[in-house]
């Protein structure tokens, strides 16, 4: 069960490292993304800043130090960043009072650049990934995830933040991204509606049913607000979800609890699980580029890593994801994705030779972009 161009094992051509929703940012349609039926109306990108508070609910987490007591460090409830910007795109304004960034929605007013000028920046996310044009970078080594296997206790917080469903992650989950290390803060999903796909990134214009984002904070920064807008300050792991013949047991641990948080702002506790099981198994084939959060504040400098391999969920599971939650204003929480944004000269890098038979519809040979990291 593979969608065109993206298969469980075949190159998806997905975005690259980034955090798309760490702060709860949403994606507005971009000039490069011509409106399509499944794309929610978006806002135009005007030039703007990128260091506003985070998008979704990014916890202001300090990297744990060896000397800190484990009870205080690991066991106290994780704190979310104010504003909970990482909530999914809804078709209504949030009722919360607070900074401007709490008042945004998918499709419609206010225009995102008005909510956060950074949303009009030149290097925004998500983008359309064209494997044929990706630059093969042998220096992009297989991703390493450390500490992503969590025992069932203590439990983790699963929340409907009005823009998405978000799982807050505890301290200790680390990703090795190139020479740096990143701490995972939270993960959230983007989806469509019945019969309508809702991934944020696309591959050669193909939109997948859904997309998972695992938002990370660089160990070079102690807090999310310090990292916003700084190159490499945030990193997001992204993977496409598509329909397969079998139930995905890892996702079922979360999807089976969605009814409990159907109402916007509600939350529940779920047993710890193997977070890496929510991601594709092939950590060696991925696309990477520098972009932004996909929801306000749309801060740039985010490293996006998009897996080439997809994750398979059953049709019933995909339906549960898109048809259970409610957002603000008595509207269903659906189509919570931002339209793709123009690359504006950015080159998407690939950890594998994606331009070679990476797509079922391989066109005539294309001059591949060169890898900036070549020789590293």
């Amino acid at each position: 069960q593979r969608l065109p161009r993206m298969q469980e094992d075949s190159p998806l051509g997905g975005g690259s490292s980034g955090e798309d929703d760490p702060l709860g940012e949403e994606d507005l349609p971009s000039e490069e993304d011509s409106p399509r039926e499944e794309d929610p109306p978006g806002e135009e990108d005007l030039p703007g800043e990128e260091d506003l508070p985070g998008e979704e609910d990014l916890p202001e987490v300090k990297p744990k130090s060896e000397e800190e007591g484990s009870l205080k460090l690991e066991d106290l409830p994780t704190v979310e960043a104010p504003g909970d910007p990482q909530e999914p795109q809804n078709n209504a304004h949030r009722d919360k009072e607070g900074d401007d960034q709490s008042h945004w929605r998918y499709g419609g007013d206010p225009p995102w650049p008005r909510v956060s000028p950074a949303c009009a920046g030149r290097f925004q996310s998500p983008v359309d990934i064209r494997p044929q044009l990706a630059a093969f970078c042998p220096a992009l080594r297989p991703l390493e995830l450390l500490g992503f296997q969590l025992p069932p206790l203590p439990e983790l917080r699963l929340r409907n933040n009005g823009h998405s469903v978000q799982l807050t992650l505890p301290p200790g989950l680390e990703m090795a991204l190139g020479p740096g290390r990143e701490y995972a803060l939270q993960l959230h999903l983007h989806w469509g509606a019945a019969g309508r796909p809702g991934s944020e990134h696309t591959v050669e214009g193909h939109r997948f049913p859904a997309e998972i984002h695992v938002v990370h904070l660089s160990t070079a920064f102690a807090r999310v607000d310090e990292a916003l807008g700084r190159p490499g300050g945030l990193a997001v792991l992204a993977a496409f979800l598509e329909e397969g013949p079998e139930e995905n047991s890892a996702y079922e641990q979360l999807l089976s609890r969605l009814e409990e948080i159907a109402e916007e702002g509600s939350e529940t506790q779920v047993p710890g699980l193997d977070i890496s099981a929510l991601l594709p198994s092939d950590f060696s084939r991925y696309f990477q580029y520098e972009g932004s959060l996909t929801t306000p504040p749309c801060a740039q400098g985010v490293i996006w890593t998009v897996f080439n391999q997809t994750v398979m969920l059953s049709a019933k599971q995909l339906h549960t994801l898109s048809d259970t939650l409610w957002g603000p204003g008595d509207s269903r929480l659906q189509l919570n994705f931002r339209a793709t944004q123009p690359l504006n000269g950015r080159v998407i890098e690939a950890s594998f030779p994606a331009g070679v038979d990476s797509s079922p519809r391989a066109a005539e040979p294309v001059q591949l972009n060169s890898c900036l990291a070549a020789g590293d």
Partner: antibody, heavy 119, light 112 residues
């Protein structure tokens, strides 16, 4: 200061029952998962049971499943272990422990209480 | 028999370095679950010594360190002292058995 104070141990006949208590102080008890761990005389540590912070989810070792019941009263900051159908092999020092560490470690331990099952 | 295997005993002279191994399987340590270490002095409750493979809670001397590789983990103690004499336990989670597992314990004897 952070501490767990246990009570309720003692001598009981095989087939009998006993309830252990563990009173927490110095930390937000209701925010933490808790466990019971036991140690038979001269032996190693054995995890017995665990309960989520809100009490909604419980876990048991196969050796006690169906006989022991873990519970908590967050309003009283107290953890319990109801032990029924006790057997000689249940003889041990029972410790309550804070299961709150996200990496799966037991951060804080009670002082332990001895349970002896003998006729 | 414990799923996490430790040597029953180790010994060393004051000032020396000793290591205690903990060997698991693909359903616990090898699956990626963290390893934690506890020290139990005679007649007392266990005390958390290392959590998350390598981290020391506040108050634990830096003479104690932990490491993990593959399906095994190790606890190292340098500058051995007489009051380090105790039982040491490793612990992890087993996803197949669905239990929090302890190793069988290792008795550390400080010689002379």
């Amino acid at each position: 200061q952070v501490q767990l104070v246990q009570s309720g141990g003692g001598l009981v006949q095989p087939g009998g029952s006993l309830r252990l208590s563990c009173a927490a102080s110095g930390f937000p008890f209701s925010s933490y998962a808790m466990s019971w761990v036991r140690q038979a005389p001269g032996k190693g540590l054995e995890w017995v049971s665990a309960i989520s912070a809100n009490g909604g989810t419980t876990y048991y070792a196969d050796s006690v499943k169906g006989r022991f019941t873990i519970s908590r009263d967050n309003s009283k900051n107290t953890l319990y272990l109801q032990m029924n159908s006790l057997r000689a092999e249940d003889t041990a020092v029972y410790y309550c422990a804070n299961n709150g560490n996200y990496r799966g470690a037991f951060d804080i331990w009670g002082q332990g209480t001895m349970v002896t099952v003998s006729s | 028999q414990s799923v996490l295997t430790q040597p029953p005993s180790v010994s060393g002279a004051p000032g020396q370095r000793v290591t205690i191994s903990c060997t698991g399987s693909s359903s616990n340590i090898g699956a990626g679950y963290d390893v934690h270490w506890y020290q139990q002095l005679p007649g007392t409750a266990p005390k958390l010594l290392i959590y998350g493979n390598t981290n020391r809670p506040s108050g634990v001397p830096d003479r104690f360190s932990g490491s993990k590789s593959g399906t095994s983990a190790s606890l190292a103690i340098i500058g051995l002292q007489a009051d380090d004499e105790a039982d040491y336990y490793c612990q992890s989670y087993d996803s197949t058995l669905r239990v929090w597992m302890f190793g069988g314990g290792t008795k550390l004897t400080v010689l002379g």
